[in-house]
């Protein structure tokens, strides 16, 4: 429960924190796990404690193991571990997953990427940092403090972002490079399972026989480009096309709409010279994206002629 | 955990009619579309159709349309491709595919092979 | 129906290298892209979906840009698990298509 992962690269400084806490007035000593040997305070070790910190100044792939850090105070002990793993350099640009920190997220508004571990460290500005190996260049890069901050981010700005900066330690000068992944999100745009706007659920609309009559299908998906989303019209379960009837025809190509800034589609279907026959049939109106499917079903009844109302919402 | 099992390997003669089947567990089956994909032997994937089980609703590739038919019965979380009459260019691995924002998971595929 | 060209057909790398895979839409699909990884005997896995996230369990030297009709899948440096077939696909309108595949063999 008590032990942390910690990792670094040959040649590099490396500084890892006791996973114990205490407060600074605590004496806390460290020791190697295997041999239960003292870790020496004395800082012209390579290898040396500093409170509740352990520090390798270079790190050699030697160093790897499981260390024990007990934090006494008056009244209690506790132990932690560190288990420290250390790398040899790659030889090319590759960063390899055990390598990396935890990925972050970003977007439009919020675009920082942290440089991990940082703060264990005796550091000046300005940091250095890469992308997928490359050197940052450019406006929209800025060094700021501890974090790089990404202007107008775009997908493209995904990927594997690895911040180098120089310890110092009495006078003396250490490399350190962290790596870790960066997503973007794009938080101009969502997707929702789709919303009928129109018709209602089981609507009745009233036609008169003899006239042409038009429903509408309008259903909303999110906010911006949307994937996969479709409205249609099916008459009995069928695709109009394949119902075959010459009369019923859905209007070609959707009308993209937005709504309060969703994504919204609309389809027509014109029934020219309603017939009786028509009111018996089931017509459904279909939304659908990556999410799902929803279905509102509108059936037709004649409309009176001595009722001059538009009674287009009205339920039995 | 999310599981598609489909149906084993078919050999069939042309003209037969076949239907195999993809078995969906560990999730809500009737809120996920699932797609049909082909493979002809050495050949790429090819998008056939899709089914939302919940509704039975189906679209077809134009490619696909009319040679075969996609179907569900939810109350056994199972989704179905069917031929009526299987040619030999039918021949090829069939993979079916959960799509939750994309094709997350797939099944292992069923072999049908139509030969005379 | 949009169709997704990929090239080249065929990369022959070493494992440690570097793969560039292209992808190119015939329209635009917005960053409604996914890459598929294929190995002899097995069902496709999904590494890169929405043209540059990386799936579940993805490792991070796979990687995925682009957006429009423009789509590039890298792998950072070649693993010898990594020798396979790569299908980008579009999902941003019906239906729903593959490209012919790009096969990346050992060299």
């Known amino acids: 429960k008590f032990s942390k992962q910690s990792w670094g690269l040959e040649n590099e400084a490396l500084i890892v924190r006791c996973p114990r806490q205490g407060k600074p007035s605590y004496t806390v000593d460290w020791y190697y796990s295997q041999t239960n040997k003292s870790i020496p305070t004395q800082e012209r070790n390579r290898v040396f404690a500093s409170g509740q910190l352990l520090k390798f100044l270079p790190a050699a792939v030697a160093d790897s193991g499981i260390y024990t850090c007990i934090v006494r105070s008056p009244t209690f002990n506790r132990t932690g571990y560190a288990n420290v793993t250390i790398y040899k350099k790659q030889s090319d640009c590759n960063v390899p997953d055990y390598l990396m920190y935890s990925t972050v997220s970003g977007s439009e508004k919020n675009s920082k990427i942290y440089c991990p571990t940082i703060d264990l460290y005796n550091w000046t500005a300005p940091l250095e940092w890469f992308k997928n190996c490359q050197a940052l260049q450019g406006s929209r890069y800025r060094a700021h403090k501890s974090f790089l901050v990404i202007d107008n981010v775009m997908t493209e700005d995904a990927g594997d972002y690895t911040c180098k900066f120089i310890h110092n330690e009495n006078g003396a000068n250490y490399s350190v490079t962290a790596t870790r992944s960066f997503t973007v999100k794009d938080e101009q745009g969502f997707s929702l399972f789709p919303v009928i706007g129109a018709p209602a659920q089981n609507e009745i609309k009233e036609v008169e026989i003899g006239k042409n009559a038009n429903l509408t299908c309008s259903a909303c998906f999110g906010k911006g480009t949307q994937f996969l989303a479709a409205v249609l019209w099916q008459l009995n379960g069928t695709k109009i096309t394949d119902f075959g009837e010459p009369r019923i025809q859905q209007e070609e190509g959707q009308n993209q709409s937005f709504s309060n800034g969703l994504a919204c589609l609309d389809m027509v279907l014109r029934i020219a010279d309603v017939k009786e026959e028509d009111l018996l049939l089931q017509y459904d109106c279909l939304a659908l994206n990556l999410h799902g499917l929803r279905r509102h079903t509108v059936r037709l009844s004649r409309k009176n002629p001595i009722d001059h109302h538009s009674h287009h919402h009205h339920h039995h | 955990e999310v599981q598609l099992v489909q149906s084993g390997a078919e050999v069939k003669k042309p003209g037969e009619s076949l239907k195999i089947s993809c078995k969906g567990s560990?999730?809500?089956?009737?809120?996920?579309?699932i797609g049909w994909v082909r493979q002809m032997p050495g050949k790429g994937l090819e998008w056939m159709g899709i089914?939302?089980?919940?509704?039975?609703?189906?679209r077809y590739s134009p490619s696909f349309q009319g040679q075969v038919t996609i179907s569900a019965d939810k109350s056994i979380s199972t989704a179905y491709l069917q031929w009526s009459s299987l040619k030999a260019s039918d021949t090829a691995m069939y993979y079916c595919?959960?799509?939750?924002?994309?094709?997350?998971?797939w099944g292992q595929g069923t072999l049908v092979t139509v030969s005379s | 129906e949009i169709v997704l060209t990929q090239s080249p057909a065929t990369l022959s790398l070493s494992p440690g290298e570097r793969a560039t895979l292209s992808c190119r839409a015939s329209?635009?699909?917005?960053?409604?892209l996914a890459w598929y990884q294929q190995k002899p005997g097995q069902a496709p896995r999904l590494l890169i979906y929405?043209?540059?996230n990386r799936a579940t369990g993805i490792p991070a030297r796979f990687s995925g840009s682009g957006s429009g009709t423009d789509f590039t899948l890298t792998i950072s440096s070649l693993e010898p698990e990594d020798f396979a077939v790569y299908y980008c696909?579009?999902?941003?309108?019906?239906?729903?298509?593959f490209g012919q595949g790009t096969k990346v063999e050992i060299k």
């Open positions: 696909q579009q999902y941003y309108g019906w239906p729903i298509t």
């Open positions: 089914i939302y089980p919940g509704d039975s609703y189906t």
């Open positions: 560990g999730y809500s089956f009737t809120s996920y579309w």
């Open positions: 329209q635009s699909v917005a960053n409604a």
């Open positions: 929405k043209a540059s």
């Open positions: 595919a959960r799509i939750g924002g994309m094709f997350d998971y």
